[in-house]
């Protein structure tokens, strides 16, 4: 899977979109999870409504919301009041049974608020390292991962 980078400004909202084939994933609930370490599990943050037909209803967990356009095939996640600790690698998932298929891998980067009087050049990454393959950019204040960049620091 390619990784798409979404950049947001600290204190503001960031909207992440995950397109998918609506017929292929028909009837499946969706989820947003946070990757714990490079090879660690993906910890569920929020999932769509228990009733698939009500997937369009926005569900919140803390400052993260999820809503699913099941006909159009777009899962949308909103991270409200973005904070530095929100930076990291996430996944949009499609669920069936206890299985979770990855729809998209997402790297969230948090930029410092330019109106904040602290260093406006700050950018919070989850970590930097040697390489990250198959990076992809989708502009919604987003960019592709640079060559030689990985969302997690190398494990010693």
């Amino acid at each position: 899977h390619n990784t798409t980078v979404f950049q947001g400004v600290a204190g503001q909202s960031l909207q992440v979109s995950c397109p998918y084939d609506s017929m292929k994933h028909w009837g499946r609930r969706k989820a947003w999870c946070r990757q714990l370490g490079e090879k660690g599990p993906c910890q569920r943050v929020v999932s769509t409504h228990n009733l698939w037909l009500l997937s369009f209803l926005r569900r919140w967990n803390g400052s993260t919301a999820i809503t699913d356009d099941t006909l159009g095939g777009t899962l949308t996640i909103t991270l409200r009041n973005l904070q530095p600790h929100d930076a990291g690698l996430y996944q949009c998932q499609s669920l069936h049974g206890s299985e979770a298929d990855t729809l998209r891998k997402v790297l969230v980067e948090v930029l410092a608020d330019p109106l904040d009087h602290r260093d406006a050049g700050d950018l919070w990454f989850p970590g930097e390292s040697e390489s990250f393959e198959d990076a992809h950019v989708e502009h919604s204040i987003s960019r592709s991962l640079l060559e030689g960049e990985i969302p997690f620091p190398p494990t010693s």
């Epitope: 084939d21 017929m23 292929k24 028909w26 609930r29 698939w52 069936h96 206890s98 299985e99």
Partner: antibody
Amino acid sequence: QVQLQESGPELVKPGASVKISCKASGYIFSYSWMNWVKQRPGKGLEWIGRIYPGDGDADYNGKFKGKATLTADKSSNTAYMQLTSLTSEDSAVYFCARLHIYDGYYVSVYWGQGTLVTVSA
Amino acid sequence: DIQMTQTTSCLSASLGDRVTISCRASQDINNYLSWYQQKPDGTVKLLIYYTSKLHSGVPSRFSGSGSGTDYSLTIGNLEQEDVATYFCQQGDTLPWTFGGGTRLEIK
């Protein structure tokens, strides 16, 4: 109504390959996952894998990776399963089944009549 | 892989009897359990999905129950046409797995 018509019985030699087919009608073939299941004589059922004809994406039971290859032809509404390097262990009836998602998980709702594959010298 | 066990491989009952077929999973399958009927001619039909939901067109004498790892299929009033082999299948985790089957005969 939904129908899954599987190809006829096959008698094949050990080491050879066979390709069996499952022709679907009564629904939009490209939009539903297709399941494949093995049943050895007098034995239970084993899940081989599933394919989404819309884009050819397939998931396999690890036990059948390298043994079975699932493909689909949207123009003829037909799903195929190729079995390679056949041995007597592959002698079985093979079923295709259309998958539906009910209550958040996949269920094989419509089944083909099965194709008997016999591996014998 | 999740193992599905049907301890009774063959069951003999009389017409009109209430028959229960059991199925056990090697771990919790979250009610993602289906029951299938295979007639002597080999045709396979879905009976029950999500533990207890009756598939359309299936007679109401069939019912399912259970949770966690233990599940059962009950035929309330056995009829001649129920002579078949019954398989349970978990749809919780890939690879999907089936029980060994329970063959039901009439005494």
